[in-house]
């Protein structure tokens, strides 16, 4: 689509005569008829296949024609066409005398013709005007002409349609040849693809407008090159998304178990020494004179029950003193003046003579102890419960109350972290000393196989004819976006040529 433009510049008819040689009365009021048609070796009458146009009266006898001539006419004259410019043409320009105001062909006598010129030739599309002058015996016409493309049409023959746009469907202007020229920040065949912030990570980042860098799930930062730790992570970092790699002093799946309780909480009092003993547990070694889990209690010398055989203890400035019951003596009432005849064994203990009856020994029944079987056995004194379990006396037996994560009579067994099936999407769980580990099936990753890793179905370049390939993340298959003129699941068929 384009326009043939004809610029009339000067017409000379000095004698003011018609083509017949007869003079115009009072002078030749001149207007022009223009016919544009396909190339003919010899220009003949017939339809103006490329268009025609008439002017109003432009002057009398000899005159120059101004641009945008008054009287409702246009100069240059416009002959639009809506086809591919063929590069050749025929042009007929007739000068006519208008005796009255009616310029229609049927209103004019045939002998009102002043002159007629016909030219033909090649003409390329372009901005430059071709200047021409045609002379007959009585008249001379000077004019110029050119062919230009209509708005939004480009190329050697005005056949390429290109309309600049800046919207969802493209961001471009048009070059003289009709090719697209992307606006700054856009790329791609139709300039629909934004150019992301320089350095934006190719896989982890994307953008919806130029110079942007938006991160895909699991990534953060200006260039989307930093991972985000797991949602439940407390004191950990990551090297890939959703990991939870514990900071120093923290343990557990979510790094929420304090392995350095001593440093973080300073639980031991009165100058005691603190030792970390596992997750959130510690042991305080008390200085002399202190007791309690955190060495928070001041120790009385008598608190250790030093007096035996029922002796009573009295605190003194320099220590303690045992008041012994009848039949006993010594610093701790440990010596007896009794014999088996005095029935010294309590709680069903049996008495055995020693040193020819000068002393005795008691053999105690289960659950009792002491030199006279006077003490009930505390089965928890030996701290039998492992891994921080709490010991409870239960009649003749004892039991251990275990901390979370441990089981067994003595809390000696670690409960499997895998018992609660923490691995998603069919991952295989492995118990490790440091916690659990999931081995993920293809297509999944992350600490618990919770991150779906897309398979790049486009890696094999399945799309033809410069089609754009996309991976359908829900099915891990490819989708081809065909360029204009091609169809098929791989864009392998030109339009109009169905598969054989």
């Amino acid at each position: 689509s384009g326009v043939f433009q004809l610029q009339l510049q000067e017409f000379v008819n000095e004698r003011g005569v018609l083509a017949s040689g007869r003079p115009c009365e009072p002078g030749c009021r001149t207007f022009f008829r223009v016919c544009l048609k396909h190339f003919q070796a010899v220009v003949s009458p017939g339809p103006c296949t490329f268009g025609s146009v008439s002017t109003p009266v432009l002057g009398t006898n000899s005159f120059a024609v101004r641009d945008d001539s008054s009287g409702g006419g246009r100069n240059p004259l416009q002959l639009p066409f809506n086809f591919t410019w063929p590069g050749t043409f025929s042009l007929i320009i007739e000068a006519w005398h208008a005796p009255g105001d009616d310029l229609r062909p049927e209103a004019l006598p045939p002998d009102a013709l002043i002159s007629k010129i016909a030219i033909q030739g090649s003409l390329a599309v372009g901005q430059n005007w071709l200047l021409d002058e045609q002379t007959s015996t009585l008249t001379r016409l000077r004019y110029s002409y050119r062919v230009i493309c209509s708005d939004n049409y480009y190329g050697d023959n005005c056949s390429r349609l290109c309309k600049k746009r800046n919207d969802h469907f493209g961001h471009y202007v048009c070059q003289p040849d009709g090719n697209l020229s992307c606006l700054p920040g856009w790329t791609g065949e139709y300039c629909q693809q934004p150019i992301c912030l320089s350095g934006c990570h190719e896989q982890n980042g994307y953008c919806s407008k130029p110079a942007e860098c938006l991160c895909r799930p699991g990534w953060q930062g200006r260039l989307c090159n930093e991972c985000i730790p797991h949602n439940g992570c407390r004191h950990g970092t990551c090297s890939t998304p959703w990991q939870c790699t514990c900071d120093e002093g923290w343990g557990g799946l979510f790094c929420d178990q304090d392995l350095n309780y001593c440093t973080h909480h300073s639980p031991c009092k009165n100058g005691a020494t603190c030792s970390n003993s596992g997750q959130r547990s510690y042991t305080c070694t008390c200085r002399p004179g202190y007791t309690g889990v955190d060495c928070e209690l001041e120790l009385s010398e008598c608190d250790s029950n030093p007096c035996r055989n029922g002796g009573s203890c009295k605190d003194q400035e320099d220590g303690y003193h045992c008041l012994c019951p009848p039949g006993y003596y010594g610093l701790h009432c440990e010596h007896s003046t009794l014999s088996c005849a005095d029935s010294p064994c309590f709680n069903g203990g049996s008495c055995r003579e020693r040193n020819q009856g000068a002393s005795y020994a008691c053999e105690c029944p289960p659950n009792f102890t002491g030199s006279n079987c006077e003490k009930k056995v505390d089965r928890c004194t030996s701290n039998p419960c492992a891994n921080g379990g709490q010991c409870l006396n239960r009649g003749p037996s004892r039991m251990c109350r275990c901390r979370p994560g441990f089981t067994g009579t003595y809390c000696e067994r670690h409960v499997s972290d895998c018992a609660r099936n923490p691995c998603a999407h069919g991952g295989t769980c492995h118990d490790l000393e440091s916690g659990l580990m999931c081995t993920c099936p293809a297509g999944f990753s992350g600490r618990r196989c919770e991150v779906r890793t897309s398979i790049d179905a486009c890696a094999s370049s399945p799309c033809f004819n410069r089609a754009t390939c996309y991976t359908d993340l829900s099915t891990d298959t490819f989708v081809c976006n065909c360029p204009y003129g091609f169809v098929g699941s791989r864009c392998e068929f030109p339009v109009g040529l169905p598969p054989s």
Partner: antibody
Framework: EVQLVESGGGLVQPGGSLRLSCAAS????????MAWVRQAPGKGLEWVAT????????YYRDSVKGRFTISRDNAKNSLYLQMNSLRAEDTAVYYC???????????WGQGTLVTVSS | DIQMTQSPSSLSASVGDRVTITCRAS??????LAWYQQKPGKAPKLLIF???ILADGVPSRFSGSGSGTDFTLTISSLQPEDFATYFC?????????FGQGTKLEIK
Amino acid sequence: EVQLVESGGGLVQPGGSLRLSCAASGFTFSNFPMAWVRQAPGKGLEWVATISSSDGTTYYRDSVKGRFTISRDNAKNSLYLQMNSLRAEDTAVYYCARGYYNSPFAYWGQGTLVTVSS
Amino acid sequence: DIQMTQSPSSLSASVGDRVTITCRASQDIYYNLAWYQQKPGKAPKLLIFDTNILADGVPSRFSGSGSGTDFTLTISSLQPEDFATYFCQQYDYVPPTFGQGTKLEIK
């Protein structure tokens, strides 16, 4: 235990400013991206802004761009939201949350009410 | 922006009932969907992320399913403490957007 405690809310006139703070504890604050999410009275939840953990990259919803600024002080375990040119439609309970624009919000504060009214 | 549409907007049920709440996205959001529970005057609490992964400490009666545009939150046997408002949220596109909420009430 993870704790996020917001403060700084209150009544402000249209066009006025307010600065919200969020004190974080129970996790290593500097390791995690943070966000502000708001909830207008009786309405749903609306993401407002996000800041990354290390380089402090920020993102905002379109309606607050140029008016709100999210920032953090890792040394103080604190998150902030500076709100300028406040409008009636900014009236909401503002929650401090741990998360990014592309991840779930794993932990939330109790919220602080911002009322914009003349 | 991606529109998230929850249904129903409110729901009455009894303790022990099985309850299902659905959430539809206006575009494919893959598996990037979370569910939250919110009680009056309280902050939301994360229940489920990545469509079906239970957040730490969330009872196993809660479960999630779906992909693409259609997602479901199921509570297998309602407990008294489950009566609350539930929100879905997509985090596949910027800005992240929430559903309008489903209020679960005692029948």
